[in-house]
């Protein structure tokens, strides 16, 4: 008799999830000498232990603590780039500007980027059929709790000037319900962070509006100011050209004509 299996609203665990996590760990530790000491089998065991045999709507940050401990990593606290709804450009940027870091440039973020996972209560099986959707099923699911945990720790580690890339093409440029808006903003430490600098990335080629005046950016400024952190905002009008100028700042087109 086939066992009844809970059907969730979200996609199931990414295929070959254990192999992917292990392979990513090995690759990361080979590329980053400061993480060579990490035992990837232990990392996988800790990752697995966070959600296997547990109800996928009842995961806590505590479940991920063994993994957090194994993945402890020091990134320069003044070189942190947060992002919201514009992950690809943020990653392209840190690939060029190698001294800045997004969460996905850290070991734990790299391991889980773009993956889905969940288990089942009281069985050691990984559920490849479906996993809980944050909205339709529950928020305390393995993926959401993981990102909430690592995002909080990443924000807590930040210092000096923290940068955030925001998507100027969206109706809510700053969204209070995003991971940035609900977790990272509230976990920046005012005693360490002097300024949050937002980069609003424009979508349209001919869009010269000052999106730093957008009501949602003003809302972000208000939240940040109330936390005793200064706020700054820049429009990035041509993201493609911006990346080119990051690669080659001496290019004549990267300097305004007098």
């Amino acid at each position: 008799v086939p066992r009844w299996r809970q059907q969730w609203s979200g996609p199931g665990t990414t295929k070959r999830f254990p192999e992917t996590v292990l392979a990513r760990c090995v690759k990361y530790t080979e590329i980053h000498p400061e993480m060579r000491h990490v035992d990837c089998q232990s990392v996988w065991d800790a990752f697995k232990g966070a959600f296997i045999s547990k109800h996928p709507c009842n995961i806590t940050e505590e479940d991920y603590q063994p993994l957090m401990k194994l993945g402890t990593q020091t990134v320069p606290c003044n070189k942190i780039l947060l992002w919201s709804r514009i992950k690809d450009l943020a990653h392209q940027f840190t690939q060029v500007q190698r001294d800045m870091f997004t969460l996905e440039d850290t070991l734990l973020g790299y391991l889980a980027d773009d993956l889905t996972w969940c288990g089942e209560f009281n069985t050691s099986k990984i559920n490849y059929q479906s996993c809980p959707d944050w909205r339709k099923d529950c928020s305390n699911n393995p993926v959401s709790v993981f990102w909430k945990t690592v995002s909080r720790r990443f924000a807590e580690a930040a210092c000096d000037v923290v940068h955030v890339m925001l998507n100027g093409s969206r109706s809510k440029i700053f969204d209070k319900n995003s991971t940035f808006g609900s977790v990272e903003v509230h976990n920046l430490q005012p005693e360490k962070v002097q300024t949050l600098e937002a980069w609003v990335i424009h979508g349209g080629r001919e869009d010269s509006r000052d999106l730093c005046q957008d009501p949602t950016i003003k809302e972000l400024e208000s939240i940040i100011s109330k936390r005793n952190i200064q706020f700054s905002c820049k429009n990035i009008y041509r993201p493609d050209k911006f990346l080119q100028c990051v690669k080659n700042p001496e290019d004549s087109s990267c300097t305004s004509e007098i």
């Epitope: 700054s232 820049k234 009008y237 700042p249």
Partner: nanobody, 117 residues
Framework: DVQLQESGGGSVQAGGSLTLSCTAS????????MGWYRQAPGKEREMIAV???????NYKDSVQGRFIITRDNTKSTVTLQMNRLKPEDTAVYYC???????????WGQGTRVTVSS
């Protein structure tokens, strides 16, 4: 704005010198060309000197040979050495990015320079 802080202005006689300094915070300073701008009473703000991250410089004709722009990326500062000042140099001076794809939307308080004849 805290991101850009200009200083060093003052009152001088024509022919005198002043050195303006600008401290910028934020990552864009390290990437972007930086410019000195000035706004004379009743006139538009204009860029008068620009320096790339690598130190290449360019000047408006009216200040060429008299003003020198330099930058120290380690200290995030841009300096404008102003020599042989003229009354028409009287203005509020500002620094900002001069990278076309990045909006120079935020400005510091500026620093006032008054040159009397």
């Amino acid at each position: 704005d805290v991101q850009l802080q200009e200083s060093g202005g003052g009152s001088v006689q024509a022919g005198g010198s002043l050195t303006l300094s600008c401290t910028a915070s934020g990552w864009l300073f390290r990437l972007a060309s930086m410019g000195w701008y000035r706004q004379a009473p009743g006139k538009e703000r204009e860029m008068i000197a620009v320096i790339t991250t690598g130190g290449r410089t360019n000047y408006k004709d009216s200040v060429q040979g008299r003003f020198i722009i330099t930058r120290d990326n380690t200290k995030s500062t841009v300096t404008l050495q102003m020599n042989r000042l003229k009354p028409e140099d009287t203005a509020v001076y500002y620094c900002n990015t001069s990278m076309p794809v990045v909006g120079a939307d935020e400005w510091g308080q500026g620093t006032r320079v008054t040159v009397s004849s």
